[in-house]
């Protein structure tokens, strides 16, 4: 069944980073429009991106209501015009998305080194705690506030003059590492959720090196 002259959406794919979540699909519409619905397993369907000619729909506002829920979306195809003028055959075509659990599946965005401070042979490296679109009591939560101790950061650091990397880990957003006095070091960090089975790691942050703007040095 389905409405004549429409084709069902396919390749429904969730694209999500730090909970910014977009559903994408194909094909580009020809003489049809789309409407997306999203629901939790126990909830009602809610329509989004009504009669859109886009092939993506931002569902962030819905999934941030409870990032630990599992969501399902479906994409309806409607003829590009009222049904009586285009011909109708009952229920519209639709295609279901894969299930999506934001807390377990959203990609971790590329982290940023906020600052580093050297005091003698110690360096304190701070990772920026990025704000997400998840809200609690009207305020946006940071990545750390959402994930708590499930989120760790791995620091890669090395002397500017060599390629041998060392690593350190933290379940806060700060590292305190030992360095050789008089040596310049470079740093990169990666966000990791060890308990995950998919999307466990972010890409590495941009490299920051001592002797550049972000650093502060004290004897």
């Amino acid at each position: 069944s389905g409405t004549t002259n429409t084709v069902a959406a396919y390749n429904l794919t969730w694209k999500s980073t730090n909970f910014k979540t977009i559903l994408e699909w194909e094909p580009k519409p020809v003489n049809q429009v789309y409407t997306v619905q999203i629901s939790t397993k126990s909830g009602d369907w809610k329509s989004k991106c009504f009669y859109t000619t886009d092939t993506e729909c931002d569902l962030t506002d819905e999934i941030v209501k409870d990032v630990k829920q599992t969501y399902l979306a479906r994409v309806f195809s409607y003829p590009a015009g009222n049904v009586e003028s285009t011909g109708s055959a009952g229920e519209p075509l639709y295609e279901n998305s894969p299930e999506f659990t934001p807390y377990l599946e959203t990609n971790l965005g590329q982290p940023t080194i906020q600052s580093f401070e050297q005091v003698g042979t110690k360096v304190n490296v701070t990772v920026e705690d990025e704000r997400t679109l998840v809200r609690k009591n009207g305020t946006f939560l940071t990545l750390r506030q959402v994930f708590g101790k499930d989120l760790i950061y791995t620091l890669y650091y090395w002397k500017s003059s060599s390629s041998g990397k060392k690593t350190a880990k933290t379940n806060t957003n700060e590292f305190l590492i030992d360095v050789d006095k008089g040596e310049n070091y470079c740093f990169s960090v990666q966000a990791v959720i060890p308990s995950r089975t998919v999307n466990r790691k972010s890409t590495d942050s941009p490299v920051e090196c001592m002797g550049q703007e972000k650093g502060e040095f004290r004897e």
Epitope: K28, P29, V30, V33, T35, Q37, S47, F50, Y51, T52, T53, F76, Y78, A80, G81, N82, V83, E84, S85, S88, G90, E91, P92
Partner: antibody, heavy 119, light 113 residues
């Protein structure tokens, strides 16, 4: 000929509920998307809600989301608007309107029903 | 949301003269795939519901006199009444149907000078 006749308007206190109906005739109701549009006294037009021809998909203006529910009974050729938690700013003439050549182009409108929210 | 801005708010024109109403959208309502502008114009007389005049920015609804014409593309649109008649006294609204929520302009009141 196409006819849309709204009913159910009246005076209601803030916080109370009201259900509007729109009886359709003269066309194949089940084949058309339907909308509610309102007009506050002396003001312009404001789109309120839409429901697809099949009744599956519904969409609302932010100003009424969570308070109003649009529905339809294709066997009775009737469109509904359930209005809960009414506010003074919901005072308006409520029109039902039919999708025309394209979604959101209204080729037929009802005469409207006045809803007054006042204590 | 797409914001629709009409100008002027009111317009007084002599019978038989031309009336021009402008409508500006905060973002383009042109869909490049079919090169159509998702814009409509309505006429509302006192105590009556609106009546569809123009859709796709320039297509006249059947039964609408040819003195009414629509033009424009993208974000800037115009409704023209080439020779104002007494029965044209009304408020005119533009509306975008490009994306939801659907939005209307604030209206332009046309009167006889």
């Amino acid at each position: 000929q196409v006819q849309l006749v709204e009913s159910g308007g009246g005076v209601v206190q803030p916080g109370r509920s009201l259900r509007l109906s729109c009886a359709a005739s003269g066309f194949t109701f089940r084949s058309y998307g339907m909308h509610w549009v309102r007009q506050a006294p002396g003001k312009g037009l404001e789109w309120v809600a839409v429901i697809t021809y099949d009744g599956i998909n519904k969409y609302y203006a932010d100003s009424v989301e969570g308070r109003f529910t649009i529905s339809r009974d294709n066997s009775k050729n009737t469109l509904y608007l359930q209005m809960n938690s009414l506010r003074a700013e919901d005072t308006a003439v409520y029109y039902c309107a039919r999708d025309g050549v394209y979604y959101g182009v209204y080729d037929y409108w009802g005469q409207g029903t006045l809803v007054t929210v006042s204590s | 949301d797409i914001v629709m801005t009409q100008s002027p708010d009111s317009l007084a024109v002599s019978l038989g003269e031309r009336a021009t109403i402008n409508c500006k959208s905060s973002q383009s309502v042109l869909f490049s795939s079919n090169n159509k502008n998702y814009l409509a114009w309505y006429q509302q007389k006192p105590g009556q519901p609106p009546k569809l005049l123009i859709y796709w920015a320039s297509t006249r609804e059947s039964g609408v006199p040819d003195r009414f014409s629509g033009s424009g593309s993208g974000t800037d649109f115009t409704l023209t009444i080439s020779s104002l008649q007494a029965e044209d006294v009304a408020v005119y609204y533009c509306q975008q149907f490009h994306s939801y929520p659907l939005t209307f302009g604030g209206g332009t009141k046309v009167e006889i000078k």
